[in-house]
């Protein structure tokens, strides 16, 4: 470790006297830092010796020798004060720039360490400090304002009391820079916008900064718009806002339009669009199937999808028949607005009854005019089965009818014994039924179908069951013929 | 809900000294300057000094230096105050009010106490 | 120290109308576009209560009917419209530099 003469760690002089500072080290030695033109420098062997004729105030500082070769990066310091009566103060740099939160040295050096017990921070012309300023002094250093915040950019003088007056150092100019997180926060207003020919529309884009130095334009397509902006300072952030106002737009006024702000961290854009039309319109859409088909009991939900400008003006949900003059509820209907000009509107059909079938539609009006849009709602029903014993052209027949939707398929099964219902170790015989015949096929009801099943002679010991199936389920009737004519079994529930 | 409880009323005599104390419940304690300030009928709001509860660091006004002491209890997040040598000039209602520590530079009292009133008097 | 001074010392406003009471400073409590001057609300037998801080920030739970504006040397409270509850007196305070000040407080009443 190198070694200074004379010793320090401080070295009091009075301006005029000569001043030798010698660093002597195992190896080469030198001095950091760059030394002003007032001080002789040269080499003496393995030390370096730094020397001047007429100390000055403004030789006030720390010197600091390091020996280079040295592994431990070792390095010897000697302060040296030079006691100007008149300039109690040296200032080793009129600008001081920091980021928010740090520590901020404001470099004036005491040039009299008498006088650290009056030395004070004040802001230029003996302001006093900002409130809740928290600073330290040094006197190898000068004053050191802890964790700077962005409002105590000063200009600022240290002051020190000399006989019984305050005596002012030159100013130091703290500049604290904001943190800059990123590029400016942006919104851009509406998301979109839809404007018939001939109405006002106003676009505004603003952006928003930690600092004031950054940047913001609207761009239409590809054309950067000239716009005067409006600035303002709030919750500690700079806003910048562009107001486009047209008066009647037109189709030119169409198009992309794009806010852009940028600082030094970079650049935030956001987008929107802008649809200019000749007259007021109104779509009704669904991603529905508008013919549906719900099992008897379960529900279902309509769904209908609105673009509309201008606004809607009314809406409902209608029961058009054909069974009751029911009309929903209205606590069943529910609209959610996706953005500005889209609408979705449900209806909720819980649990449906049979008198629930048909058809319902969403009627909307705009000053386009209305729209309507009609879903039709068929119920699905498991099929109903019955049997009866007759004659027809003279001959035993068995008629089953069978009542379902979708319309029922029938199968005639023939087992032996006497049973409810005829399992598949009794079977005899199968018959299936290709084109039972059509009784009735009502628009939203059952379809009714007859099925025949011709029989010469019955046996007695067996027993015929129709069976009826669609897509909901299955339903079934058992026939026993007996010697005073015949009986009939629904199948057991 | 935040609160700043006073210590109740004080009658005391001249020459005497008072310490009234300030409760912070629902608040970090040491986010917030704890703040004095004087009313009294005749000089409206007067600003005493504060304290910052992190490392009991005291700003005074000068007018009140000599008379007011401010200590803080962080363990019971209690601000106090004293008044020393007590005359009929410091008959008035005593308010502890918070002011925020942050990076933000606004420092405005955004709690105050219910006020504790002391009357000088022989 | 900073001296506030503020004007006038009472008033009396209608129900619904304006009110507009003013803070000026001794020097300017300005700095890199902060203004840091703030309004309280006093009833009586009650505390102040912060409404507006740095000049025209809404403290939280505060109406809309409260407003703030000024720069530098002048500053302004706006109540509109005014209502019943808003009788108290009103005052400006200063955190720029120690020691903080206040104004000598406006008188609010409401015809």
């Known amino acids: 470790i190198p070694v200074i003469e004379p010793s320090g760690p401080e070295l009091v002089v009075k301006p005029g006297e000569t001043v030798t500072l010698r660093c002597v080290g195992n190896g080469s030695v030198e001095w950091d830092g760059p030394i002003s033109p007032h001080w002789t420098l040269y080499s003496d062997g393995p030390s370096s010796v730094l020397t001047t004729n007429n100390a000055t105030f403004q030789n006030t500082r720390t010197y600091r020798c390091t020996e280079p070769g040295d592994p431990l990066g070792g390095s010897a310091a000697i302060h040296l004060y030079v006691k100007d009566p008149a300039r109690p103060w040296n200032v080793l740099a009129k600008e001081v720039v920091v980021f928010e939160d740090q520590d901020a040295l404001l470099p004036c050096l005491l040039t009299d360490p008498v006088l650290e017990a009056g030395v004070s921070l004040v802001r230029l012309r003996g302001r006093p400090l900002l409130r809740h300023t928290n600073y330290s002094f040094s006197p190898w250093h000068g004053f050191i304002i802890h964790r700077a915040k962005f409002i105590q950019g000063q200009d600022y003088q240290c002051s020190a009391l000399m006989g019984g007056r305050k005596v002012m150092s030159i100013s130091i100019r703290l500049k604290v820079q904001k943190v800059i997180p990123g590029p400016p926060a942006l919104t851009l207003v509406p998301a979109e916008l839809v404007r018939i020919r001939g109405e006002a529309a106003q676009i505004v884009c603003s952006a928003s900064n930690i600092d004031v130095d950054f940047d913001v334009f609207l761009q239409h397509n590809t054309t950067k718009l000239a716009i005067p902006q409006r600035s303002d300072f709030h919750d500690n952030r700079y806003q910048k806002v562009l107001t486009l106002s047209l008066g009647q737009v037109d189709f030119q006024h169409a198009g992309n339009y794009s806010c852009v702000a940028s600082n030094v961290q970079g650049k935030h854009s956001t987008s929107m669009f802008f649809q200019v039309v000749e007259s007021a319109y109104l779509d009704l859409s669904s991603e529905q199937n508008l013919i549906q088909e719900v099992t008897v009991g379960e529900g279902l939900n309509l769904k209908v999808m609105v673009e509309a400008y201008p606004g809607l003006q009314g809406f409902n949900w209608t029961y058009l028949g054909p069974f009751s003059d029911h009309q929903p509820e209205p606590k069943l209907a529910n609209a959610t607005t996706k953005d500005t000009y889209r609408h979705t509107f449900t209806l909720s059909l819980p649990r449906l009854k049979p008198s629930e079938a048909g058809r319902y539609s969403f009627l909307a009006r705009n000053p386009g005019g209305w729209r309507a849009l009609t879903f039709e709602l068929t119920l699905r029903y498991p099929p109903e089965v019955s049997v009866i014993w007759t004659s027809i052209n003279g001959s035993g027949t068995l008629l089953c009818a069978a009542s379902g939707y979708p319309q029922p398929n029938v199968t005639w099964l023939q087992c032996a014994g006497h049973t409810d219902r005829c399992d598949e170790a009794q079977v005899l015989q199968v018959w299936v039924d290709p084109h039972p015949e059509v009784l009735s096929q009502e628009p939203f009801q059952k379809v009714t179908v007859q099925s025949l099943l011709t029989a010469e002679t019955l046996e007695h010991n067996q027993t015929y069951e129709c069976r009826a199936h669609n897509s909901v389920g299955s339903g079934s009737w058992a026939f026993i013929p007996i010697s005073a004519g015949a009986r009939t079994h629904p199948p057991d529930e | 809900e935040v609160q700043l409880q006073q210590s109740g009323p004080e009658l005391v005599k001249p020459g005497a000294s008072v310490k009234i104390s300030c409760k912070a419940s629902?608040?970090?304690?040491?986010?917030?300057?704890m703040n004095w300030v004087k009313q009294s009928p005749g000089k409206g709001l007067e600003w005493i000094g504060d304290?910052?509860?992190?490392?009991?660091?005291?700003t005074y006004n000068q007018k009140f230096k000599g008379k007011a002491t401010l200590t803080v209890d962080k363990s019971s997040t209690t601000a106090y105050m004293e008044l020393r040598s007590l005359t009929s000039e410091d008959s008035a209602v005593y308010y502890c009010?918070?002011?925020?520590?942050?990076?933000?530079?606004?420092?405005?009292?955004?709690?105050w106490g219910q006020g504790t009133s002391v009357t000088v008097s022989s | 120290d900073i001296v506030l001074t503020q004007s006038p010392a009472s008033l009396a406003v209608s129900l619904g109308q304006r009110a507009t009471i003013s803070c000026r400073a001794s020097e300017s409590v300005s700095s890199h576009d902060i203004h840091l001057m703030h309004w309280y609300q006093q009833k009586p037998g009650q505390s102040p209560k912060l409404l507006i801080y740095?000049?025209?920030n809404l403290e939280s739970g505060v109406p809309a009917r409260f407003s703030g504006s000024g720069s530098a040397t002048d500053f302004t409270l706006n109540i509109h419209p005014v209502e019943e509850e808003d009788a108290a007196t009103y005052f400006c305070?200063?955190?720029?530099?120690?020691?903080?000040?206040f104004g000598g407080g406006t008188k609010l009443e409401i015809k």
């Open positions: 740095a000049a025209s």
């Open positions: 629902a608040i970090t304690f040491t986010d917030y300057y």
């Open positions: 009010a918070r002011e925020k520590i942050s990076m933000e530079y606004y420092y405005a009292m955004d709690y």
């Open positions: 305070q200063q955190s720029i530099e120690d020691p903080p000040t």
């Open positions: 304290i910052n509860p992190n490392n009991g660091g005291t």
